[in-house]
């Protein structure tokens, strides 16, 4: 038995279902009674999900996974898991044995997009051209961890003066502050961008500095 | 490398019981499947039954079903067979065995060195 | 259950001869057979899986053939360490049963 899963990682949002494909091609005859299916963490060997003795077994793995019944017997394999959590990323290991077996691996790539970033200014009034400000940019509840980029009104990179700092909730989630420390212009734009490296999705915000008042 | 060591030689009394342990090495031992064979003196090889340790389940032959249990425990990575309501024709070496290189569970690359029972009044 | 028939139950032969010993499904197994070698006092040997799959590190003077109900190991060249009991196994249905075996003793 030959065992086929997708060559490139799974990616699922938090909260979303995902599909694990995972396919043998079984031979002229083949009946349920003969197969063993067993999904797994490829790492710690955890048992996901089973098939075998005819049935399913059913989930061993916060009740939250699920096979395709009727398409096993064509040779579809493949596991539905629900309400991704960013604790189920990694790999997955799809085992089947009817008279001998084969195994592949799959990876699951958790992602959730990072919201559109809020910006504050300190201090925020009484400022003059040649001041040091410190502009924060705060975007929530993105995964994996962002990349952070800030750039001045004529979009030339800002890199002296960033400090981000990136910590997880109690889901695994996010939250991203990146502080820039610069000196005011005369006048001039702000500009921070939070990007999900995995969605390659971009979360703009800004702050223009016009003399007063100020434009967010 | 997979090893399977199996425990020491035993003599029963007909109608008691006896559980004979293989302890696995050197191989994903909670995925595949454990099988039980015996071999009767200057007899052939006879297939009791297996279990796949990280389901827990097991499958036994006919000929042996509601007088022998495997069982595994995949913390110390060992697997048992029991065989209960011994009798004289039960005197045979007890093998373990597990399928590996040759891609199947059915068929058996690695064996235990076999554990000699000894049934006799 | 199926029936697994080996043929001949004793086998003898030389030094360099070439043999083949038999084995009957009772019903069929497609590929499903495997090929073991035992030696007195000691566990069987994988030789042959799916039939005609020769294990690793089993010498190429082995060889399998044959589906459906009726197989064949044949041995090309008789080497003196080949001399020993062989066995067939089907492993198409549960159980997985075995032949009677076959000995290959010295002529």
């Known amino acids: 038995v030959e065992v086929q899963v997708s060559e490139d990682p799974v990616v699922a949002l938090v909260d979303t279902d995902a599909t694990l494909r995972c396919s043998f091609s079984p031979e002229p005859g083949f009946s349920l009674a003969q197969l063993n299916l067993i999904w797994q963490l490829t790492d710690t060997k955890q048992l996901v999900h089973s098939f075998t003795e005819g049935r399913d077994q059913g989930s061993a793995y916060s009740n939250r996974t699920a096979l395709f019944p009727d398409l096993l017997v064509q040779g579809n394999a493949s596991l539905r898991l629900q309400r991704v959590r960013v604790t189920d990323e990694g790999s997955y290991t799809c085992f089947v044995s009817i008279q001998d077996f084969d195994s592949a691996a799959v990876s699951l790539q958790v992602a959730a997009p990072y919201s559109k970033p809020s910006m504050t200014l300190e201090p925020n009034k009484d400022l003059r051209p040649g001041n040091m400000v410190t502009i924060t940019c705060s975007s929530y509840q993105g995964y994996p961890e962002a990349e952070v980029f800030w750039k001045d009104g004529q979009g030339v990179p800002l890199t002296g003066n960033v400090t981000t700092s990136q910590m997880a909730n109690e889901r695994g989630l996010f939250d991203v502050h990146s502080v820039l420390r610069v000196v005011l212009g005369a006048n001039g734009t702000y500009s921070c961008l939070v990007r999900n490296p995995v969605l390659q999705q971009d979360a703009h915000g800004s702050v223009t500095i016009t003399g007063q008042p100020l434009t967010f | 490398q997979v090893q399977l060591v199996e425990s020491g030689a035993e003599v029963k009394k007909p109608g008691s019981s006896v559980k004979v342990s293989c302890k696995a090495s050197?191989?994903?031992?909670?995925?595949?499947?454990i099988s039980w064979v015996r071999q009767a003196p200057g007899q052939g090889l006879e297939w009791m039954g297996r279990?796949?340790?990280?389901?827990?389940?097991?499958n036994y032959a006919q000929k042996f079903q509601g007088r022998v249990t495997i069982t595994a425990d995949k913390s110390t990575s060992t697997a048992y067979m029991e065989l209960s309501s011994l009798r004289s024709e039960d005197t045979a070496v007890y093998y373990c065995?597990?399928?590996?290189?040759?891609?199947?569970?059915?068929?058996?690359?690695?064996w235990g060195q076999g554990t000699l029972i000894t049934v006799s009044s | 259950d199926i029936q697994m028939t080996q043929s001949p139950s004793t086998l003898s032969a030389s030094v360099g001869d070439r043999v083949t010993i038999t084995c009957r499904a009772s019903?069929?197994?497609?590929?499903?057979l495997a090929w073991y070698q035992q030696k007195p006092g000691k566990a069987p040997k994988l030789l042959i899986y799916?039939?005609?799959s020769l294990q690793s590190g089993v010498p190429s003077r082995f060889s399998g053939s044959g589906s459906g109900t009726e197989f064949t190991l044949t041995i090309s060249s008789l080497q003196p360490d080949d001399f020993a009991t062989y066995y067939c196994?089907?492993?198409?249905?549960?159980?997985?049963?075995f032949g009677q075996g076959t000995r290959l003793e010295i002529k």
């Open positions: 279990i796949i340790p990280i389901l827990g389940i097991a």
């Open positions: 065995a597990n399928g590996g290189d040759s891609s199947s569970w059915y068929t058996f690359d690695y």
């Open positions: 799916k039939a005609s």
């Open positions: 019903e069929t197994i497609s590929s499903w």
């Open positions: 196994q089907q492993y198409y249905s549960y159980p997985i049963t």
């Open positions: 050197g191989g994903t031992f909670s995925s595949y499947a």
